[in-house]
């Protein structure tokens, strides 16, 4: 009460100060400043709290973007859009929210964390829960059997977010996917050399790639005794071991979803192995697995996958990980997870993944529950957890204390002496026109000071100096903000001097 | 927590420069305007040099104008005070500080200060 | 410039008494006006703004009046840890001047 009463008698002090100031005349620039004073210290006091006790605060687990954020993201974007490009793909968009009966039954547990919208008139609907579901449902819909696709977008769920390590309510996926019937696990290795290609021009630190087959995992619970009815959610059990011991694992197993300790410890001695193709061969002899048709499909078309990894030259950034166990109800085939890796305290140590950062897998048999007819149109794709990477490339940034520019300005429109506003926008309009980044201090007689400031602090690599010498001269001097170094250019050649500089085509074609 | 750290003090010659920094931390460092005050040894206070939030507004005291530079970079909550030709008269300490309700030219939250003393 | 000019420069008190601190402006400050204690090798402390109001997490011992050209600063009664120096300072027109410092010693 206090503070707002001290703020109150500020505001009240501003406001004399400002009208003492007009009357005075004082010079414009004081009368500015002190206006926006007087507008912050309104803008503190704010409505009377007794009226509005309204927190002004965007929604849990969701965060603006500032200039800078923007930066980064368009960055990581851009590597991410390229690699898709190369690899041929074609782009689509889908509605931010669709019928909640097109989401329904397709995520398992998970469900639980989708979004329903308030009555719509009539139709009940949801917010996105990622991009895979929407895909097929947009296959279906069109009939189309064949595509090659990336989608970048927002998806929504409501999990409890630890939003210091890149997890939200709301978050950008970008999704690369192939559709179509082909021969056997060459699509499947194109999108982990995607995932590796992605990870690796990121620039975001050592990783590695977990594979696995929902069919060997299928095959490992029936083997060991799990019924039909358990094994998803025993999966979901499984796939914590990235983050849990065993042992907990196994608790939760056992005490939680009823499953008999004998049978726990028969999948433990699955789970915890990973390797790269030898275990896929040596899983190829095991006696009781080999004898298991879901689990024999899957090593082989594992040990197929391995061979095109290899000629692809990602082998070894690729690790087979019988605990993977991706929580999603949709896959069928291949899955596979990209985790970044802590360097190991000790040479000789484990490396220590820092969660996943890029995940996919092969699901045959989502499109066809759109299908009437339950047409299968087998698909495998991938996801970048591009918010993770974000919070990655910030700290990064801020650790090596990086400059970011926010805007791409090639040049600023100065001027060096007073009353010279209509030739900054004379000039800084012909260079909009021949497609130069360029902008201008909405100032009359702006101090060059402040404008070369401006440069400096804005990152923009050139300003172009209008005097009443140079008018005279049809010239325009273009200086460098970093060297400080001057010349002289003709106004005539001044957009191709610009353009030199900056490296840009000389043709905006 | 909030807090300013200066850091950037030293031993300098008559005529020669510094640069001095103020790391600022727990608060929205781009709203509020900035200062740089000195002490002298043993002497009274003194005003520098202000900034505003967005970089809109400085000012300096007549005795350092021309000479001194203030700065401050939003993106790493840094407050700077380049100083150029100093003389003896400037050996002081130099404190940032923030203005109180980001405005009004009376400082609320204070670093340690930095020592700089200038001589030959 | 705007002058503030302190009295006295320095007062010496015993732990409970009332201590009354003066500053005045060389023109009319209106209540821009702020309190600050320092101990030595410290950075001051703000106690009092806009002439009477009391800085957060200060002791309610401590209150300012005044305005115009003359204020003052009140301990209604003093503590051990308050024994520093206090500077008044205008913050009405730049450059913003301080008063030259009141030493408050222990008796």
């Known amino acids: 009460m206090a503070e707002r009463a001290a703020l109150e008698e500020l505001v009240k002090l501003q406001g004399e100060r400002v009208r003492g100031l007009k009357q005075q005349k004082a010079s414009a620039e004081l009368i500015e400043e002190e206006v926006a004073k007087l507008l912050k210290l309104k803008a503190q006091l704010g409505p009377d709290e007794s009226k509005q006790k309204f927190v002004l605060k965007t929604p849990k687990g969701t965060r603006d973007y500032s200039p800078r954020q923007m930066a980064v993201r368009e960055k990581v974007f851009d590597v991410i859009i390229r690699c898709f490009k190369r690899h041929g793909a074609e782009v689509i968009d889908t509605p931010v929210f669709e019928l909640k009966e097109t989401l329904m039954g397709k995520y398992g547990e998970d469900s639980k964390l989708i979004y329903d919208l308030k009555d719509q008139g009539g139709e009940l609907l949801s917010l996105r829960y990622d991009l895979t579901v929407p895909f097929a449902r947009y296959l279906a819909m069109n009939k189309l059997t064949n595509i090659k696709r990336y989608h970048i977008a927002k998806v929504y769920r409501r999990d409890n977010p630890a939003m210091t390590r890149g997890r939200y309510r709301e978050f950008y996926q970008c999704d690369f996917d192939i559709a179509g019937n082909f021969d056997p696990m060459i699509p499947d290795a194109e999108c982990l050399k995607i995932m590796c290609e992605i990870l690796s021009s990121l620039q975001i630190g050592d990783f590695l790639v977990k594979v696995n087959d929902r069919r060997i995992l299928d095959g490992m619970f029936a083997i060991c005794g799990v019924s039909d009815s358990k094994f998803r959610t025993i999966c979901s059990s499984v796939d914590k071991l990235d983050k849990v011991s065993w042992e907990e694992v196994k608790n939760e197993m056992v005490g939680e979803k009823g499953l008999a300790p004998e049978v726990a410890d028969r999948i433990g001695d699955y789970v915890q192995q990973h390797g790269g193709v030898s275990l896929v061969e040596q899983l190829l002899q095991d006696p009781k697995l080999s004898q298991n048709k879901q689990a024999l499909e899957g090593l082989g078309d594992l040990k197929l996958l391995f061979e095109y990894l290899t000629l692809f030259g990602i082998d070894d950034k690729i690790s087979f990980d019988l605990s993977l166990a991706r929580g999603l109800d949709y896959y069928t085939g291949v899955i596979y997870e990209a985790v970044l890796l802590q360097t190991p305290a000790q040479a000789g140590e484990e490396p220590l993944g820092v969660g996943s950062v890029a995940a996919g897998g092969r699901y045959d048999g989502l499109v066809g529950m759109f299908d009437p007819k339950g047409r299968k149109v087998p698909c495998v794709g991938l996801s970048i957890g591009v918010e993770r990477i974000f919070s990655i490339v910030e700290q990064r940034l801020e650790a090596l204390e990086e400059k970011i520019r926010t805007t791409e300005t090639q040049v600023l429109v100065a001027s060096a002496q007073k009353k010279l506003l209509e030739e900054r926008l004379k000039l800084v309009s012909e260079l909009w026109d021949a497609g130069i980044k360029a902008e201008l201090l909405y100032k009359k007689n702006p101090k060059l000071l402040n404008q070369l400031q401006y440069c400096e602090e804005a990152g923009i690599p050139l300003v172009a100096i209008i005097g009443e010498q140079e008018l005279k001269d049809g010239v325009i001097k273009l200086r460098s903000v970093t060297s400080r170094e001057e010349v002289d250019v003709r106004r005539e050649d001044l957009v191709e001097e610009i353009k030199r500089r900056t490296g840009q085509p000389l043709c905006i074609c | 927590q909030v807090q300013l750290v200066e850091s950037g003090g030293g031993l300098v010659k008559p005529g020669g420069s510094l640069r001095l920094s103020c790391a600022a931390s727990g608060f929205t460092f781009s709203d509020y305007y900035m200062t740089w005050i000195r002490q002298a040894p043993g002497k009274g206070l003194e005003w520098v040099s202000y900034i505003s939030g967005s970089n809109a507004y400085t000012d300096y005291a007549d005795s350092v104008k021309g000479r001194f530079t203030i700065s401050r970079d939003n993106a790493k909550n840094s407050l700077y005070l380049q100083m150029n030709s100093l003389r003896d008269e400037d050996t002081a300490v130099y404190f940032c500080a923030r203005y109180v309700y980001q405005v009004v030219a009376i400082g609320d939250l204070w670093g340690q200060g930095t020592l700089v003393t200038v001589s030959s | 410039d705007i002058q503030m000019t302190q009295s006295p420069s320095s007062v010496s008190a015993s732990v409970g008494d009332r201590v009354t601190i003066t500053c005045r402006a060389s023109?009319?400050?209106?209540?821009?006006l702020a309190w600050y204690q320092q101990k030595p090798g410290r950075a001051p402390k703000l106690l009092i703004f806009a002439a009477s109001s009391l800085q957060s997490g200060v002791p309610s011992r401590f209150s300012g009046s005044g305005s115009g050209t003359h204020f003052t600063l009140t301990i209604s009664s003093l503590q051990p840890e308050d024994f520093a120096t206090y500077y008044c300072q205008q913050a009405k027109s730049f450059p913003y001047t301080f008063g030259q410092g009141t030493k408050l010693e222990i008796k």
């Open positions: 023109q009319g400050i209106s209540s821009w």
